[in-house]
């Protein structure tokens, strides 16, 4: 019974001691993304290199079909960054022609899937009005936050136009996760 | 058999439980820059203030030089936001003058030095195009994610123009990395 | 002399190994704001959503009157984002009436009261220009860093107007952080 | 001495099927990404497909996509290209590369190439 | 029609310098990533010559270098010898095909 005294005896039964070194974890990075069908109003997900460049999962973190897979339930910290790139926005367009100002826009969404829900459920959403001026624009969306998550569940990112993501280099477009 | 020891089972052995306060920490907030050297098409480094105000270094995590100094191999997550300021982009003026837009852009990158490498690799990468209308703009550009990282790494912050940078508070402009 | 094994004598005096499922956490998520009266030139904080959907606090970490209290000292990681959105800004207005180009700006402020200590630390800041063309305009501020904090620390999030906080989805505005 | 010592090319008929092998030797094989390169009869060469270390990922030029599936036995050292529905445009001395690390795929080159096999693809 | 473009032949007496051009675009040399050199002697499998813009492996005379600027890349050759006639291609990491990719080859004459 000795060791008791340095915590309320519950702990060790959820969360044991354990080596940092064996936590799952992922960081993935942005590759060329194929056109695929999607339903109308649900946002495309991206799909991800998971061990070339920068890119690695490990300890029972796995990546399959765009989802990263969570293998053990506790809190995570989920972050990803898209950079989105263009032309002059319709909005820029429609100024000129004198039509109201609707702007368009570029939007991130970091999606949970749990196979006992039926609905996904948004985690994380940054979304930001495009109303550029020059010719070309680009810009990142940054996400980041902790999240308890169960062991099963399912994680991706959604974007608004998959067309728009800046694919060219794995440091601009990229997702992980790692369990605190 | 050689090179199976560094395989699954390994993990006691690189990753023994250990004490969270005595993992290599480091938060650099932002300082006046001096102008400096840099090769055309490299970005110039910033150097950091590591130790007044909100900057500390801790558990052999040094800082020397604009590099931060990786003290022991394993997973960590680094961190920055670099806030940029300027008068009317050249953009603007471009377009006020009939000329094409070609805007402006404002980038931060957060590079990783390896000594047995040649070359630098860009860990993460913010870009943003820049075409503001009015005659002061400002923003930040945030980065953050998780890296394996080697004991000897050196980890530094470019920025695609260093008289832009936002030095006049330690919260608008700063770098960090912790050991998972 | 049991348990020397495990690592350096050294860490058992200031950093006993702990379970990681017991360190204080909390993600809080953002509801309607309800006008408040604050001091000129002091932003106002944001109240959050502490238990409700997404939002937790575990471990001894309390939200209490827009505040994050920190139970235990030692280094947390902070974040929070802020989705903004308006009409079209006062710098389009002004610059449509030929006026000086005054931009509009938006502030996130992550602040630290220490009762010890008569005025707030402001630990993150994202500030950003808003002249925006199209009349209506919607953005995020990340904000994320590593932070030393004390036993009794309270944390805030303030903005520079509360009026232009999208309150509408848990997903596009919150605030967290853990003990790393 | 790394070596690579490609296996299986042949005369085969449009349509038809083949299947490459290249042994590894001299070289931590499943630290390293590996490649198959062709070089049609008096023409330059051309990239054909690259897996990661483990085999978890894969990438093929969009002039075989659907077609050729490579893949990799690391037990055994040996790296595999699958070639189905063949056609006259496959006609090729196909070579096995060796690229850098997982880690530097994006910026490392092939540093050690086998002596090829030849494919020829006609009726 | 190949990624990266190349002269298709260069020549050179023996102890000229000659300088073998490679253009790429924004989704490849121009997005940064490495350009390597290759030789290629009649018959034989190619050879890597230059890595990463303008490194030599063991082995290679360092009459060869390489250089890298915006989306181009050349190979040069100082004190040309009758054995550097070959085939050179130079080769780069493009994103918008999510592979690697070759120039379409320089044949060098050695007068």
């Known amino acids: 019974l000795k060791g008791q005294e340095f915590a309320p005896s519950h702990q060790q039964v959820y969360a044991p001691l354990r080596a940092d070194g064996d936590k799952p974890r992922a960081h993935l990075t942005v590759v060329r993304q194929t056109p695929t069908q999607h339903f109308k109003n649900q946002f495309p997900a991206l799909h991800w290199e998971h061990e070339l460049g920068l890119a690695f999962t490990k300890n029972r973190m796995n990546y399959t079909n765009k989802f990263l897979l969570i293998p053990e339930s506790g809190d995570y910290f989920i972050y990803s960054q898209v950079t989105f790139r263009g032309m002059t926005s319709e909005c820029s367009e429609i100024r000129q022609a004198g039509r109201p100002n609707k702007p368009d826009s570029i939007t991130v969404v970091i999606t949970k899937v749990t196979d006992s829900y039926p609905e996904p459920t948004q985690l994380l959403m940054g979304t930001k009005s495009v109303c550029e001026v020059g010719s070309n624009w680009f810009q990142p969306i940054y996400l980041g936050a902790m999240f308890s998550l169960q062991e099963g569940d399912k994680l991706m990112v959604n974007v608004s136009d998959i067309s728009l993501v800046d694919y060219t280099k794995e440091d601009k477009t990229f997702f992980g996760a790692f369990l605190l | 058999l050689k090179g199976q020891e560094f395989a699954p089972s390994h993990q006691q052995v690189y990753a023994p439980l250990r004490a969270d306060g005595d993992k290599p920490r480091a938060h650099l907030t932002v300082v006046r820059q001096t102008p400096t050297q840099h090769f055309k098409n490299q970005f110039p480094a910033l150097h950091w203030e590591h130790e007044l105000g909100l900057a500390f270094t801790k558990n052999r995590m040094n800082y020397t030089n604009k590099f931060l100094l990786i003290p022991e191999s394993g997973d960590y997550f680094i961190y920055s936001q670099v806030t940029f300021r300027g008068m009317t982009s050249e953009c603007s003026e471009i377009r006020q003058a009939g000329r094409p837009n070609k805007p402006d852009s404002i980038t931060v990158v957060i590079t990783k030095v390896t000594d047995s490498y040649p070359e630098p690799t860009q860990l993460l990468m913010g870009t943003k195009s820049v075409c503001e209308v009015g005659s002061n703009w400002f923003q930040p550009i945030y980065l953050g994610a998780m890296f394996s990282l080697q004991e000897g790494d050196k980890l530094m912050v470019n920025v695609s123009d260093i008289s832009l940078v936002d030095y006049t508070k330690e919260d608008k402009t700063f770098f960090g990395a912790f050991l998972l | 002399l049991k348990g020397q094994e495990f690592a350096p004598s050294h860490q058992q005096v200031y950093a006993p190994l702990r379970a990681d499922g017991d360190k204080p956490r909390a993600h809080l998520t953002v509801v309607r704001q309800t006008p408040t009266q604050h001091f000129k030139n002091q932003f106002p904080a944001l109240h959050w959503e502490h238990e409700l959907g997404l939002a937790f606090t575990k471990n001894r970490m309390n939200y209490t009157n827009k505040f994050l209290l920190i139970p235990e000292s030692g280094d947390y990681f902070i974040y929070s984002q802020v989705t903004f959105r308006g009409m079209t800004s006062e710098c389009s207005e002004i610059r449509q009436a030929g006026r000086p180009n005054k931009p509009d700006s938006i502030t996130v402020v992550i602040t630290k009261v220490t009762d010890s200590y008569p005025e707030p630390t402001q630990l993150l800041m994202g500030t950003k220009s808003v002249c925006e063309v199209g009349s209506n305009w919607f953005q995020p501020i990340y904000l994320g860093a590593m932070f030393s904090l004390q036993e009794g620390d309270k944390l805030m999030v303030n903005v520079s107007d509360i009026s232009l906080v999208d309150y509408t989805k848990e997903d596009k505005t919150f605030f967290g952080a853990f003990l790393l | 001495e790394i070596q690579l010592l490609e296996s299986g090319g042949g005369l085969v008929q449009p349509g038809g099927s083949l299947r490459l092998s290249c042994v590894a030797s001299?070289?931590?094989?499943?630290?390293?990404?590996m490649s198959w390169v062709r070089q049609a009869p008096g023409k330059g060469l051309e990239w054909v497909s690259v897996?990661?270390?483990?085999?978890?990922?894969?990438y093929y030029a969009d002039s075989v996509k659907g077609r050729f599936t490579i893949s990799r036995d690391n037990s055994k050292t040996t790296l595999y290209l699958q070639m189905n529905s063949l056609r006259a445009e496959d006609t090729a001395v196909y070579y096995c590369?060796?690229?850098?690390?997982?880690?530097?795929?994006?910026?490392?080159?092939?540093?050690?190439w086998g002596q090829g096999t030849t494919v020829t693809v006609s009726s | 029609q190949s990624v990266l473009t190349q002269p298709p032949s260069v020549s050179g007496a023996p102890g000229q310098r000659v300088t073998i051009s490679c253009t790429g675009s924004?989704?490849?040399?121009?997005?940064?990533?490495?350009v390597h050199w290759y030789q290629q002697l009649p018959g034989t499998a190619p050879k890597l010559l230059i890595y990463g813009n303008n490194n030599r492996p063991s082995g290679v005379p360092d009459r060869f270098s390489g250089s890298k600027s915006g989306t181009s890349a050349s190979l040069a050759i100082t004190g040309l010898q009758t054995e550097d006639e070959a085939d050179y291609y130079c080769?780069?990491?493009?994103?918008?095909?999510?592979?690697?990719?070759f120039g379409g080859g320089t044949k060098l004459t050695v007068l």
């Open positions: 080769q780069s990491y493009d994103s918008s095909l999510s592979g690697w990719v």
């Open positions: 924004s989704s490849n040399i121009g997005a940064g990533y490495n």
């Open positions: 001299g070289f931590t094989f499943s630290s390293y990404v």
């Open positions: 897996i990661s270390g483990s085999g978890g990922s894969t």
């Open positions: 590369a060796k690229g850098g690390t997982n880690y530097y795929y994006y910026y490392s080159g092939m540093d050690v």
